[in-house]
């Protein structure tokens, strides 16, 4: 008999487990300052109406969608008004605007400090008195610091850490066994996060037709020996998985994702040869696998594009029947072909076919028009190809560090008006691409690359779009997904910008600074770097570099001095003169 | 426009064979999965079975598998199905099918009768 009830249908496909781990990451990616205990009180009101209903589907309320149950939850939290302010706004509402609410209030940059690991005894013991609770708080923790996390995944992520715990906190030396793997697993989350934010953000601002164009490439990629139709159905799938999970439909998407998965390893004869040990694994290590499947062998057999996509006589004809349909197929034929492709190659490359042959198939002699298509690729190839040539060069002669100040500089010139916090932020993370990329063998640098740089540039987009200072910024976000980088690229030095006034209390420091971890360190040392840009966008790189040698060493006297603060407080002045003087 | 027309249906007995064609025109037929299903008297549709545009694979439903063979001439714009060692629950209307996308279908033919009976 079909299920009346949307919130036991979900409840009896997910199991309590999961069902309760995706209701609190639902409602602390919406109400991301209150505390654990709320939503542990939350998710537990839930859970127990989702097993009545689960039990008796025509209980009362038992047939509300769950938008209605969810936003009905939130909005009994009685500190809304004073926590969130206009967020309270939203209860006022009916569904679906009352959704649409909620997620328009979700904050990107919600100022958490970082997550870290404090003493590992500590950690142990919490984890060993109550497991549940401990899991829980790291599911909140990571879910209101990052309000668009892919929830199925992160459920994958906190079974990790789960996983880390049950080791470690055996182990002799818990320390030594926890940092690197919570480490490593944290480097694998952010990395998750912002991968997310940059799906939600191609479906919010460019739609279904940019992400699922997107996801052609990157799957034609991946399974080269599937056919059109097989990644057809793969990709319209995936988008929507995803739009569920970006519109906060947690349930839903998780659900969705277990079928699809069930789907790829019921048909991996037609999808790839790649997928039977992930097939073999329980539920989330097997989404997981496949979300990180490597990539099947080409068939050996694949023809010459040109033969239907420009020496076809038919070619017009073909793309006139069915326009979308015909673009997929050369996006899709052109992307199994060319794994070295980065994914926003790929899509340029697919959009500079269809404007050709919307010119060329309205003129007399189409095929002598679009005939010479295939050349017109190659500056569109040759451009990302240098750029990452020429920026790994600077990379392995700069190492990361290094790197990622060549990065902030050039940043800070092109968008001077972008906040310090969010020029530090963005251009370490660029600069950790060398790291990330340039370490792989010439075949893979450039789809590493680029489209490691997409999902960073996303966020510079979303932060910027809080608090919007900068036309360029917005200009090259707004216009085109696939040329976000290009355009970034293409800025020059920013000449209408009015240098900001010297302040000395931005360049005043104390001893506290040597206490901080190594990251931090580097974190004040680069935003005094952009602060001093600003402040001379027309500073050399000599000058620059000669400046920042000498608060390097400024750091490292006062902080091996027996009087820290007092050489902070007497060095200091006398630094910042020296740099005004060489930046004169 | 799309057309899609099937021929070669007819009665047989158990355990004899028919091919099925099925000629394709008004879209580009080497780009497509193409497929049969069939509908037997009081029943729904089921895939019989389909293959790539390339034709380097193919499916078949349990029921028939061992028994059909499905292939494809690109160059002739045809589709066909070579059906052996009928059975009675065989009996059905078999529909030609074009398929954008796995699982689905946009167009399919008018259909051609198979009746297997002795």
């Known amino acids: 008999e079909a299920q009346q009830s949307e919130i036991a249908h979900r409840y009896n496909d997910l199991g309590e487990e999961h069902f309760k781990g995706l209701v609190l990451v639902a409602f602390s990616q919406y109400l991301q300052q209150c505390p654990f205990e709320d939503h542990v009180k939350l998710v537990k009101e839930m859970t127990e109406f989702a097993k009545g209903c689960a039990a008796d589907q025509s209980g009362a309320d038992c047939g509300k969608s769950l938008h209605t149950l969810f936003g009905d939850k939130l909005c009994t939290v009685a500190s809304l008004r004073e926590k969130y302010g206009e967020l309270a706004d939203c209860c006022e509402k009916q569904e679906p605007e009352r959704n649409e609410c909620f997620l328009t209030h979700k904050d990107d940059n919600p100022g958490f400090p970082p997550l870290v690991t404090p003493d590992p005894e500590v950690m142990c013991t919490a984890f060993q008195e109550n497991e549940q609770q401990f899991l829980g708080k790291y599911l909140y923790e990571v879910a209101r610091r990052h309000p668009y996390f892919y929830a199925p995944e992160l459920l994958y992520y906190t079974q990790q850490y789960k996983g880390v715990f049950t080791e470690c906190c055996q182990a002799a030396d818990k320390a030594a066994c926890l940092t690197p793997k919570t480490e490593a697993l944290r480097e694998k989350v952010l990395v998750s996060s912002a991968r997310e934010r940059f799906k939600c953000a191609s479906l919010q601002k460019f739609g279904d037709r940019a992400f699922k164009a997107w996801s052609v490439a990157r799957l034609s990629q991946k399974f080269p020996k599937a056919d059109f139709a097989e990644v057809s159905k793969l990709v319209t799938d995936l988008t929507k998985v995803h739009k569920e999970c970006c519109h906060g439909d947690l349930l839903e998407c998780a659900d969705d994702r277990a079928d699809m998965a069930k789907y790829i390893c019921e048909n991996q004869d037609s999808i790839s040869t790649k997928l039977k040990e992930c097939c073999d694994k329980p539920l989330l290590e097997k989404s997981q696998c496949l979300a990180e499947v490597e990539r099947d062998e080409l068939p050996g057999d694949l023809t010459p594009l040109a033969a239907d996509f420009v020496e076809d006589k038919e070619v017009c004809k073909n793309y006139q029947e069915a326009k979308d349909v015909f673009l997929g197929t050369f996006l899709y034929e052109y992307s199994r072909r060319h794994p070295e492709y980065s994914v926003s190659l790929l899509l340029r490359l697919a959009k500079e076919y269809e404007a050709t042959l919307e010119k060329c198939c309205a003129t007399a002699d189409p095929p002598s028009c679009y005939g010479k298509v295939f050349d017109e690729f190659k500056p569109l190839v040759e451009e990302p190809q240098n750029l990452v040539k020429v920026n790994c060069e600077l990379f392995e002669k700069l190492g990361e560090y290094g790197f990622q100040n060549a990065l902030l500089v050039r940043y800070t010139k092109k968008l001077p008006q972008v906040s310090t916090p969010t020029l530090v932020e963005v251009s370490r993370k660029l600069g950790k691409v060398g790291t990330k990329c340039c370490t792989k063998p010439e075949t893979e640098r450039m789809s590493c690359a680029e489209d490691y740089l997409a999902v960073v540039l996303n966020r510079l987009c979303v932060l910027h779009e809080k608090t919007p200072v900068s036309d360029r910024v917005t200009k090259c976000c707004s216009e085109s997904l696939v040329n976000r980088r290009p355009c970034f690229s293409a800025l020059a030095g920013d000449e209408t910008y009015v240098p900001k006034e010297f302040n000395a209390e931005t360049f005043t420091f104390h001893a506290d600074l040597c206490t901080l971890p190594d990251a931090e360190k580097q974190v004040k040392k680069q935003s005094a770097l952009v602060e001093l840009l600003k402040h001379k966008p027309k500073a050399t790189e000599e000058q620059l570099k000669t400046v920042m040698g000498d608060f390097g060493a400024f750091v490292d006297k006062c902080c091996a001095a027996e009087n820290k603060e007092g050489c902070f407080a007497e060095e200091g002045p006398k630094l910042v003169a020296a740099a005004q003087a060489a930046l004169a | 426009e799309v057309q899609l027309l099937e021929s070669g249906g007819g009665l047989v007995q158990p355990g004899g064979s028919l091919r099925l064609s099925c000629t394709a025109s008004g879209f580009t037929f080497r780009h497509y999965r193409m497929g049969w299903v069939r509908q037997a008297p009081g029943k729904g549709l089921e895939w019989v079975s389909w293959?790539?545009?390339?034709?380097?694979?193919?499916y078949y439903a349990d029921s028939v598998k061992g028994r059909f063979t499905i292939s494809r001439d690109n160059s002739k714009n045809t589709l066909y199905l070579q059906m052996n060692s009928l059975r009675a629950e065989d009996t059905a209307v078999y529909y030609c099918a074009k398929s954008y996308m796995a699982g689905t279908f946009d167009y399919w033919g008018q259909g051609t009768l198979v009746t297997v009976s002795s």
């Open positions: 293959i790539r545009p390339d034709g380097t694979f193919t």
